[in-house]
Interface confidence: medium
């Protein structure tokens, strides 16, 4: 599923991401835009043999199990394929664990490079939330 911007903002708010660990909803929508272009089925392979999955591009080295990443920790205790569902529950729950891990949203390279320090509220402007 490819979400619309406001559609995703509403879904993320329903799942409790607004101001989760101090990060406003705009941060999460911005991260999803630059990680996956709002596509829940996005997958991207990394040079270390791991793969990033889903709307927030969660990595199989640490957070989920795709059955083929050497030394996978699977800290979210889920199959990576669950992160590709049109229902973003699994991605949100895992993202909450990631953002609580100490580095906050810096764990997402796209957020760090494209969203951090910008007017992230623009990503939810005009949305009925």
């Amino acid at each position: 599923k490819v979400f619309g911007r406001c559609e995703l903002a509403a879904a993320m708010k329903r799942h409790g991401l607004d101001n989760y660990r101090g990060y406003s909803l705009g941060n999460w929508v911005c991260a999803a835009k630059f990680e996956s272009n709002f596509n829940t089925q996005a997958t991207n392979r990394n040079t270390d043999g791991s793969t990033d999955y889903g709307i927030l591009q969660i990595n199989s080295r640490w957070w989920c199990n795709d059955g083929r990443t050497p030394g996978s920790r699977n800290l979210c205790n889920i199959p990576c394929s669950a992160l590709l569902s049109s229902d973003i529950t699994a991605s949100v729950n895992c993202a909450k664990k990631i953002v609580s891990d100490g580095n906050g949203m810096n764990a997402w390279v796209a957020w760090r490079n494209r969203c951090k320090g910008t007017d992230v509220q623009a990503w939810i402007r005009g949305c009925r939330l």
Partner: antibody, heavy 116, light 107 residues
Amino acid sequence: QVQLQESGAEVMKPGASVKISCKATGYTFSTYWIEWVKQRPGHGLEWIGEILPGSGSTYYNEKFKGKATFTADTSSNTAYMQLSSLTSEDSAVYYCARGDGWYGYWGQGTTLTVSS
Amino acid sequence: DIELTQSPATLSVTPGDSVSLSCRASQSISNNLHWYQQKSHESPRLLIKYVSQSSSGIPSRFSGSGSGTDFTLSINSVETEDFGMYFCQQSNSWPRTFGGGTKLEIK
């Protein structure tokens, strides 16, 4: 136990297309990548690409882009590979395998012969 | 693409001999190297994963070693059922690649 059952041998004419199937049993089909591998005598084993059945995500070896197309049906736990515009170079044994980084589970292979 | 070069191409041995098969990668692949055996008209069978981890049901006479770019599959006291082709495969990067194979034949 994990098993991959491939469709039977095919004899096709040059220019035609063929669709090979790979039915998986014994594990959660949607959560593991299915890999496709080509074997020709004297050419060893070649990785064609992979599909994650739960999402339909696919990756192809550049060499096989435009030649192979992967699909999967999670209701029947079956992965498919279609090969198009067949030539004699496509005559080979094609294997599906479960993608665990290594390939611990293989189909029995489908022999494709392209001949006029 | 990572190229895997296997040597020798053919190895002629007598049952009871011990042998070593080599697989060399064109660049470092850490420990992401796996070995397969294939007999005529059969699918490949996983022997060793991640350089040295034996696959389930594989006899203890098969062992693997190496790291980086140079890897070895050793067979301690070859048995008649061991004759066939042996392939290495890397999962360090895409596309996945295989070595050209070593044929183990009876002398």
